[in-house]
């Protein structure tokens, strides 16, 4: 028998520095977690203790903090090289800055293979990107070899900016011939490493003949066997065992997100490459694990540029950006409109001639808007200003909801109106009218939404049984501020870009902004 240790991360999202327990900015260092310096300490410890170790990343290193905003992926290549990752799968967020923003900082600089079997380049891009990412890689480990096949969510064109010269194929259809080829070449230990979410990971384990282990990402799935060490609630045991169609037991793993845990899986293979046993658990990277001094010093060196960046002007406002709780928790506020407009703008993807865009709606809890921006400071808007407005380090995500769920959400928005509570919704691509004289749960009297399947966008009444795409903060997608109906009833949830980054990019693009209060949210006569 031959034993392999798989160390894995996924959805790190730019958390190069240690973070608080909820993966936001580290405040009290003695209680902070994760970060590449701490990760390196643990990885090195395991490499020294065990003979056959692979360090893998299942995608979405890009996007999430000011590190990515400033360094645009160069930081990912630099620190992943320093940690000596063995392979990485492409995630959807790796395309956030277009294909060029993937090729130049990451693909050309990475000293490890970057993989995806279901992304096919065409046209002029095919020769430019040739060999920079691969469908699979055969890695020597000790006296044996292991084949790693990559995959990426086929929803990427709706979630990011891969352009028109990359085709995202069905994962299972694309993986099978690559695995078959590896088998023909007598590579008999095969790991599928990819970024399509836990459901697809399980399907790959079930359907792709010859895959021995699946290491996934995208859905931020936390798996654990025994008592979990922090706040995350396990979605199942680690590893999660899937019985394949040909009767094999295939371990599937994921390691939550944000570099908080290091996935640790031990696999035992027989001489024919069959999995005999698998066991392990994610390792919580808490403050009991010291940060590696050399990596930490490097982080501090790279940090200097971030501090300079946060005071630079992104653009100007010629109007007061009203982000006060007195406005945003009671009525339409122009800061809410600005943020929602930025959220929609960030999700413009013309992937189908029938649609002007795939999504037109935005909702945003007023309680998430934490500060106004005064235009009387020469109109200057900096990252620092935006960090005061959006201090929680969240993301603006894409969900699919039924109209009936949206109606419930808007009822919840005003169910206890007047108490300055955070659930009051700011909107984009939505016209809502409330009648506060009616009883809670029956106060939405008009709800019109902007069409997407149209050449001239216009507002139509919400249909209860129709499925709509909506951009919203991850806080709401996860049921925050009492929006349990969103969490419970959403049909699909894809994590998006860092909130501040979305707004800063929009302001930089527009150069000068002047958002107005324009009647998106109204109260019917006699009640307000």
């Amino acid at each position: 028998a031959w034993e392999l240790t798989i160390l894995h991360t996924n959805d790190v999202h730019s958390r190069l520095e240690q973070t608080s327990e909820d993966s936001s900015k580290c405040v009290n260092a003695s209680r902070c977690m994760g970060g590449v310096a701490r990760l390196f300490t643990k990885v090195q410890q395991i490499r020294r203790a065990e003979p056959n170790v692979l360090l893998l990343d299942a995608g979405d290193q890009y996007q999430g903090t000011i590190w990515f905003t400033v360094y645009k992926g160069a930081e990912v290549a630099h620190f992943m090289n320093a940690l000596r990752y063995d392979a990485m799968a492409l995630g959807n967020h790796e395309f956030d800055n277009g294909v060029e923003g993937l090729i130049e900082p990451l693909l050309k600089e990475a000293k490890f293979p970057i993989l995806s079997a279901n992304i096919k380049a065409k046209g002029p891009l095919a020769s430019q990107i040739s060999g920079l990412y691969l469908p699979y890689k055969v890695l020597p480990v000790g006296d044996e070899v292991v084949g790693i096949v990559g995959y990426t969510s086929k929803e990427t064109p709706f979630l990011s900016n891969p352009g028109t010269n990359l085709v995202f194929e069905d994962e299972i259809t694309a993986l099978q011939p690559e695995v078959d080829k590896l088998k023909t070449l007598n590579v008999n230990k095969i790991i599928a490493l990819g970024h399509s979410g836990f459901e697809m990971d399980k399907l790959i384990a079930q359907k792709v003949r010859g895959v021995d282990v699946v290491v996934g990402g995208h859905s931020n799935t936390f798996l654990y066997t025994g008592n979990p060490p922090s706040k995350e609630v396990p979605a199942g045991k680690y590893p999660f065992i899937v019985t394949s169609d040909d009767g094999r037991k295939v371990p599937v793993v994921q390691a939550y997100a944000f570099g908080k845990y290091l996935g640790y899986l031990k696999i035992e293979f027989d001489e024919r490459g069959n999995v005999i046993s698998s066991h392990g658990n994610p390792i919580l990277l808490n403050s009991s694990i010291p940060e590696d001094p050399s990596i930490k010093a490097d982080i501090n060196k790279w940090r200097i540029k971030l501090d300079n960046y946060s005071t630079q002007e992104l653009g100007k406002t010629i109007v007061y950006l009203d982000g006060s709780s007195q406005s945003c928790r009671f009525r339409e506020c122009n800061m809410g409109n600005l943020i929602c407009d930025a959220m929609i703008n960030n999700n413009l993807r013309h992937t189908d001639e029938m649609f002007w865009n795939h999504v037109s709606m935005c909702i945003l809890n007023g309680g998430g808007i934490r500060s106004p921006i005064d235009e009387r400071n020469n109109g200057t808007i900096t990252w620092e200003n935006l960090a005061a407005v959006l201090p929680f380090g969240g993301t603006f995500d894409l969900v699919q909801l039924k109209g009936s769920t949206l109606k419930k959400a808007f009822e919840h928005s005003v169910h206890r109106y007047g108490q300055s509570t955070g659930e009051f919704l700011q909107v984009g691509g939505i016209h809502v009218v409330y009648d506060l004289s009616r009883k809670p749960g029956d106060r939405v009297v008009k709800l019109d939404v902007l069409c997407t399947k149209c050449r001239v966008p216009s507002y139509d009444p919400l249909k209860m049984d129709e499925v709509y795409k909506v951009i919203l903060p991850n806080f709401l997608a996860n049921g925050g501020d009492g929006f349990q109906m969103i969490k419970d009833e959403l049909l699909r949830h894809d994590s998006g870009d860092q909130d501040i980054n979305v707004v800063s990019t929009y302001i930089s693009k527009m150069k000068v902004i002047y958002p107005a209060v324009e009647g998106r949210i109204k109260f019917s006569t006699g009640s307000h």
Epitope: V138, K183, N186, R272
Partner: antibody, heavy 117, light 110 residues
Framework: EVQLLESGGGLVQPGGSLRLSCAAS????????YSWVRQAPGKGLEWVSA????????YYADSVKGRFTISRDNSKNTLYLQMNSLRAEDTAVYYC??????????WGRGTLVTVSS | QSVLTQPPSASGTPGQRVTISCSGS????????VNWYQQLPGTAPKLLIY???QRPSGVPDRFSGSKSGTSASLAISGLQSEDEADYYC???????????FGGGTKLTVL
């Protein structure tokens, strides 16, 4: 010790048939894929055919497709190459080779096939 | 005519370093691992390098391999008289669905 021993070579007339065998020892035969590679006198190496570990997948060079058949018998630890419709240009030393990991890692000593009238 | 192109001959004096190149295309070297074989006169080929740059046990570290894009190379440092042999590069070809060998390079130690 890993050993691959070819047999079945010899002189055959054009259009004739020959069956090559390769007996394996010193390792678990069924865990590997195999290939046949040939070398014409004074020339370079030319891949002929390959068979997967399970025997479910077979591959052939265009020059032999439709004339040669690769097969294996795991119970006998033996690899075969059935060669039909032989031509003068098939004259070569035929090597039985084990596929290691993404490579041909072990070779037999070879058996000479001469096609001549 | 092989699809993998090698120089037909190379030479060097004892102690010297020689490099043998192997040029292919996206469907073979571009997408697959390259192997190198040594064939001494009158013997079967022997694996020298696999997975582009890995040496099997028993192969001296004077032999090293590398790959970049659609080309690969074999370097032999500290050349010795017993290195005089034919050297072949080989890889799988995705289009042909089979193995490809280079035409071979005859190395002479002067």
């Amino acid at each position: 010790e890993v050993q691959l021993l070819e047999s079945g070579g010899g002189l055959v007339q054009p259009g004739g048939s020959l069956r090559l065998s390769c007996a394996a020892s010193g390792f678990t035969f069924s865990s590997y894929a195999y290939s046949w590679v040939r070398q014409a006198p004074g020339k370079g190496l030319e891949w002929v055919s390959a068979i997967s570990g399970s025997g479910g997948s077979t591959y052939y060079a265009d020059s032999v497709k439709g004339r040669f058949t690769i097969s294996r018998d795991n119970s006998k630890n033996t690899l075969y190459l059935q060669m039909n419709s032989l031509r003068a240009e098939d004259t070569a030393v035929y090597y039985c080779a084990r596929l290691g990991y993404s490579t041909i890692d072990k070779w037999g000593r070879g058996t000479l096939v001469t096609v001549s009238s | 005519q092989s699809v993998l192109t090698q120089p037909p001959s190379a030479s060097g004096t004892p102690g010297q370093r020689v490099t043998i190149s192997c040029s292919g295309s996206l469907s073979n070297i571009g997408r697959n691992e390259v192997n190198w074989y040594q064939q001494l006169p009158g013997t079967a080929p022997k694996l020298l390098i696999y997975l582009n740059n890995q040496r099997p046990s028993g192969v001296p570290d004077r032999f090293s391999g590398s790959k970049s894009g659609t080309s690969a190379s074999l370097a032999i440092s500290g050349l010795q008289s017993e290195d005089e042999a034919d050297y072949y590069c080989a890889t799988w070809d995705d289009s042909l669905k089979g193995w490809l060998f280079g035409g071979g390079t005859k190395l002479t130690v002067l």
